[in-house]
């Protein structure tokens, strides 16, 4: 029950996280015009990964896409790539995790297969979350660097009479959405990995040893470790006293009525 809950919760948390990563990637407010200690303008600038926008006091908002690919900063391209990789991995992870969910029955899928799929999706979520966090952090670092550079050169102009105020940009809402979403995806991935361990616990089978009544030599057949979910596996240790000391292990696995909810 705890395993199912952990897996289900991991899936939901990851789903929310990936939805957040997608939202952050699409959002226009990755960087917003810094309003602190600046002249108050009737124009508000903000930028995303795909376009830059201007909102005027009149209420008019105008957005222009970055129609060039080669002319964009390498860092911006890197952030785009990280976010897209995060989304793709997350989407595949979600798809895999749906089939891995213990509460969903798909044919006669073994629990060991579900465990593997849960682990795979968990790893995918972790990498997806890390990609998003890395992408957002790279962009944030780029903003901080540019902010201090533009602060140093805030007023440029000839002779100091005519001044051009450089627009400084600070963290936009998308960065916070991205960080939170990346974190959630990461947590969801960890939960899936934990659930995987619960789905496939290591089980030691202690084999039965039978002794001949006459006290003759004992034949011991060691049993190895057998991975099992504990559901639907019927382990029978038959002790046969036929005058010789031997063990016969018969492990049969077949679906029981308790296999799936």
């Amino acid at each position: 029950m705890a395993v199912t809950a952990c897996q289900g919760l991991g899936f939901v948390v990851s789903l929310i996280g990936i939805a957040g990563i997608i939202a952050a990637t699409c959002m226009d407010q990755w960087s917003t015009q810094d309003l602190y200690n600046n002249p108050v303008t009737a124009v508000f600038n903000y930028q995303g990964l795909w376009r830059s926008c201007v909102r005027e006091s009149s209420g008019f908002t105008e957005c222009r896409g970055y129609f060039t690919l080669l002319g964009l900063p390498a860092m911006l391209q890197a952030v785009r790539a990280l976010m897209i990789v995060g989304i793709v991995l997350g989407a595949i992870g979600l798809l895999v995790s749906i089939f891995a969910l213990k509460c969903i029955r798909i044919g006669s899928m073994e629990d060991s297969a579900k465990a593997n799929m849960t682990l795979t999706s968990g790893i995918m979520f972790i990498v997806s979350g890390l990609c998003a966090i890395a992408g957002v952090s790279v962009f944030a670092n780029m903003l901080v660097t540019n902010f201090w550079m533009s602060t140093a050169n805030m007023y440029t102009g000839m002779g100091g009479m005519v001044q051009t105020v450089q627009t400084r940009y600070t963290f936009g809402a998308a960065l916070f959405v991205g960080w939170v979403a990346g974190g959630l995806t990461l947590i969801g991935g960890v939960m899936m990995c934990i659930a995987c361990r619960g789905l496939a616990p290591e089980e030691t089978n202690y084999k039965a040893v039978s002794y001949h009544a006459s006290g003759h030599s004992v034949a011991y057949k060691p049993g190895g470790f057998k991975a099992s979910t504990g559901f639907g596996s019927n382990t029978k240790n038959k002790k046969i006293y036929d005058g010789g000391a031997r063990t016969e292990d018969e492990v049969q696995s077949y679906p029981s009525k308790h296999d799936y909810v």
Epitope: A42, V43, S52, V54, S57, S58, V162
Partner: antibody, heavy 120, light 112 residues
Framework: EVMLVESGGGLVKPGGSLKLSCAAS????????MSWVRQTPEKRLEWVAT????????YYVDSVKGRFTISRDSAKNTLYLQMISLRSEDTALYYC?????????????WGQGTSVTVSS | DILMTQSPSSLSVSAGEKVTMSCKSS????????????LAWYQQKPGQPPKLLIY???TRESGVPDRFTGSGSGTDFTLTISSVQAEDLAVYYC?????????FGAGTKLEL
């Protein structure tokens, strides 16, 4: 047709109060940014205050901050300018204006104005 | 506050003449985000409220005759009337639409 009609002007003593109104018609009032602009007897134009459409943020020229309040009643399609602690330098013709949504913050429509005289 | 300086303060012209008036701002009115200039030109005839002629430094408001042309960028702007008509006799104001407080120039009076 867009119409802006100001009212409420008049003669007032220094330190007195006055409330100007601007009745708007012919456009979706609530979504437009509105401003008050005054013209002094010397014919100089001075922007007084702005209220942002939708958001309701307000901006004022330094000389009227704390004395003038711009507000709007979208149900009545009316813009207001509450003026207190009036001074002689507030004497002017007060225009109600609309900021055009595609005009780069320029004022595309102006009312005929209402006259405010502050004198003892 | 942004200082808007208009020159000349008055212009005597004859009908059909080409007229140019200047407006300078103490800070750039060019927005880096969209590369647009936030400057407007208004025309005010006696006894009337100002009328918008040009916005965004160079875009004519609808209904404005094409003899009116706005140009310039950053801090230096110009309004040109290619062939002055009698009905163009008025005071012309430039306005900063970029920074609060919005500020107007003192005006250029066009007279015969």
């Amino acid at each position: 047709e867009v119409m802006l009609v100001e009212s409420g002007g008049g003669l007032v003593k220094p330190g007195g109060s006055l409330k100007l109104s601007c009745a708007a018609s012919g456009f979706t009032f609530s979504s437009y940014t509105m401003s008050w602009v005054r013209q002094t007897p010397e014919k100089r134009l001075e922007w007084v205050a702005t209220i942002i459409g939708g958001y309701g943020n307000t901006y004022y020229v330094d000389s009227v901050k704390g004395r003038f309040t711009i507000s709007r009643d979208s149900a009545k399609n009316t813009l207001y300018l509450q003026m207190i602690s009036l001074r002689s330098e507030d004497t002017a013709l007060y225009y109600c204006t609309r900021l055009g949504q595609t005009q780069r913050n320029a004022m595309d429509y102006w009312g005929q104005g209402t006259s405010v005289t502050v004198s003892s | 506050d942004i200082l808007m300086t208009q020159s000349p303060s008055s212009l005597s012209v004859s009908a059909g003449e080409k007229v140019t008036m200047s407006c300078k701002s103490s800070q750039s009115l060019l927005n880096s985000g969209n590369q647009k200039n936030y400057l407007a030109w208004y025309q005010q005839k006696p006894g009337q409220p100002p009328k918008l002629l040009i916005y965004g430094a160079s875009t004519r408001e609808s209904g404005v005759p094409d003899r009116f042309t706005g140009s310039g960028s950053g801090t230096d702007f110009t309004l040109t009337i290619s062939s002055v008509q009698a009905e163009d006799l008025a005071v012309y104001y430039c306005q900063n639409d970029y920074y609060y407080p919005f500020t107007f120039g003192a005006g250029t009076k066009l007279e015969l």
